[in-house]
């Protein structure tokens, strides 16, 4: 629902960092948290970490799952600790604010 | 128990074609992705084809793409390899295997050879 | 396409011994990095997933270490069913093997 939005919010969160942007670190600080799986020549990769940027992830978190892509996103200190991105299964509509959590 | 048994490997000349067969069981076959790997004699391993769970989205090494073709039939529980217009260096164990999603390669069968030569 | 490099291609050791084996990623893999061991006229068999977990019924003397480009698999201390073929995988992106590295009896 519209409602649901998150508001544009100067605060930031910790998030768990996991993958190839988070160099030799295991958490980040951002306005979000995100985790995302994204299928590459078939195989499933599992990437977590954060927007600096409340903006830079505004598309992101509302773009709904594809079958080769999706994006989980957050706001609260750790709250991608235990979500993990999954694809849409058949016969599933996900619409974009689905995909949101807050916390 | 998981098992994949692969079959349809044998001799064929330069040019022709084969259809690899992989039949699988032990699990839920819709549920995963599949994969072909294969083997050259005394060489390393060379990932070949992907598959997802429904058959709609595939995915090919370099050295394949436009002459192989991966599909999959879940009523049979197995996955297919087309190769057409195969050359000497096609010649390798080809290997059937499955990923769970935070897995990858977890299972693989007991390969079936493919001969290309004249 | 990500180049995978292991050293040494070959190495000889005997049983109870430390074994160490190198893999280098030409770029940032994170931690999308299996080992597999092959033994003669077998298939692959996975060891170690996402860098450093162990596949379950997999001996503990097996541990995998490393994130970024540089990955290594140890084994404790070798036993005689341990020689074999090991390769490294890589699935961030264009997944690609490396090109083995045997392990022999001294």
């Known amino acids: 629902m519209e409602d649901e939005k998150p508001k544009v919010n100067p605060k930031l969160y910790m998030c768990v960092c996991e993958g190839l942007s988070c160099g030799n670190e295991d958490h980040c600080e951002g306005q979000q948290c995100f985790s995302s799986l994204s299928i590459n020549d078939g195989f499933h990769v599992y990437q977590k970490g954060c927007f600096q940027v409340y903006e830079q992830g505004k598309m992101t978190c509302k773009t709904p799952p594809s079958p080769g892509q999706a994006v989980e996103c957050c706001q609260g200190d750790w709250c991608n600790r235990n979500i993990t991105a999954q694809l849409p299964t058949k016969g599933k509509s996900f619409p974009g604010t689905q995909n949101f959590h807050l916390e | 128990e998981v098992q994949l048994v692969e079959s349809g490997g044998g001799l064929v000349q330069p040019g022709g074609s084969l259809r690899l067969s992989c039949a699988a069981s032990g699990f839920t076959f819709s549920n995963y992705y599949m994969y072909w790997i294969r083997q050259a004699p005394g060489k390393g391993l060379e990932w070949v084809s992907s598959?997802?769970?429904?058959?709609?989205?595939?995915y090919y090494a370099d050295s394949v793409k436009g002459r192989f073709t991966i599909s999959r039939d879940n009523s049979k529980n197995t996955v297919y390899l087309q190769m057409n217009s195969l050359r000497a260096e096609d010649t390798a164990v080809y290997y059937c295997?499955?990923?769970?999603?935070?897995?990858?390669?977890?299972?693989w069968g007991q390969g079936t050879l493919v001969t290309v030569s004249s | 396409d990500i180049q995978m490099t292991q050293s040494p291609s070959s190495l000889s050791a005997s049983v109870g011994d430390r074994v160490t084996i190198s893999c280098k990623a030409s770029q940032n893999i994170y931690k999308y990095l299996n080992w597999f061991q092959q033994k003669p006229g077998e298939a692959p068999k996975l060891l170690i997933y996402y860098s450093n977990s162990l596949q379950t019924g997999i001996p503990s003397r097996f541990s995998g270490s490393g994130s970024g480009t540089d990955f290594t698999l140890t084994i404790s201390s070798l036993q005689p069913e341990d020689f074999a073929i090991y390769f490294c995988?890589?699935?961030?992106?264009?997944?690609?093997f490396g090109p083995g590295t045997k392990v022999e009896i001294k």
């Open positions: 598959i997802n769970t429904d058959g709609g989205s595939t």
């Open positions: 995988f890589q699935y961030s992106s264009g997944p690609t």
């Open positions: 295997a499955k990923s769970t999603p935070n897995i990858p390669l977890a299972y």
